[in-house]
């Protein structure tokens, strides 16, 4: 069964700057990745970035830089200032549309006891929804 993992890290240099990394553990071809915060995309969450393998990347503040790390994983850096900046208990979600498996989504947040600059290892997060 395909799985999605989510890793959230707070940057040591900027305490309100976050890096979100997400990956897809499955055999299919990724057709679209959507990163959101505040809950799953389409269920109260707000889209931060959408990544398409051929057509490129779209991102919305406070997202600063979204990019592909591998063919099945992405990273997103969030700007750490302003009213819309994330806080330590913010939930981030990644939805991978995979061809032909369908859509798989998981969420994660900063580990409760993590020090700035540290993060939990990228273990598979619970799958919230598979369309």
């Amino acid at each position: 069964t395909p799985e999605v993992w989510v890793q959230v890290r707070m940057e040591a240099t900027e305490l309100s700057s976050f890096t979100i990394r997400c990956g897809f553990l499955g055999s299919g071809s990724i057709s679209l990745v959507t990163v959101s915060w505040g809950g799953p995309n389409g269920a109260g969450g707000t889209t931060l970035a959408v990544l398409h393998p051929e057509r490129g990347i779209r991102q919305w503040a406070p997202a600063r830089q979204a990019r592909w790390e591998t063919q099945s994983s992405i990273s997103l850096i969030l700007e750490g200032s302003g009213a819309s900046s994330p806080c330590a208990n913010t939930t981030f979600c990644c939805k991978f549309a995979s061809f032909p498996e369908g859509s798989w989504e998981a969420c994660g947040s900063l580990p409760p006891s993590s020090d700035p600059g540290l993060s939990a290892p990228p273990t598979p997060a619970p799958i919230l929804r598979a369309d």
């Epitope: 071809s29 057709s31 051929e54 057509r55 490129g56 779209r58 991102q59 919305w60 061809f99």
Partner: antibody
Amino acid sequence: EVQLVESGGGLVQPGGSLRLSCAASGFTFRNYDMHWVRQVPGKGLEWVSDIGNSGETYYLGSVKGRFTISRENAKNSLYLQMNSLRAGDTAVYYCVREEFGYGMDVWGQGTTVTVSS
Amino acid sequence: DIQMTQSPSSLSASVGDRVTITCRASQGIRNDLGWYQQKPGKAPKRLIYAASSLQSGVPSRFSGSGSGTEFTLTISSLQPEDFATYYCLQHNSYPLTFGGGTKVEIK
């Protein structure tokens, strides 16, 4: 209600210029890619240009360097500046919305551009 | 550029008929494909997105299938209001490209 309303079409001579506008309402404009698609009367549909939420632009090869797509998110407006117009640019031009990666879903009613001497 | 070859270019059918329209992509596009209906003097209207998902408000007699390079739009029981021209659109890569269209006429 989600709505797209084009304006600015008309008759122009070959080599001339025209600026099309599209007024969007009923949705969060800045969250969507916006496209221009054209159709020669009685013929098929042809994609012309796309602009991303932050202003990334993409063009059909035959219009690159002559057409410029732009947007004003604060005004919920999309534009197409068309220069060095040719007879082959004669068409109905549609403004179209896309939730990026999911395809075009909402179309305006179109505005007609005629390039003729 | 990805070419979308749509067939047939026109067809004649009767109310109640099952109608099938095909689009073939010149290279794989996964499921980045939509189907549109256009009536004379009107803007196109989306029927199907992601190759097989029905657009909200569209009657269930319309269905889409396929992936990769071969795609099909099926109208299970043609109704009088379905006589129109149908187009496929690939949004997998730039430039986005439409099929040539299929005009569905009354027999």
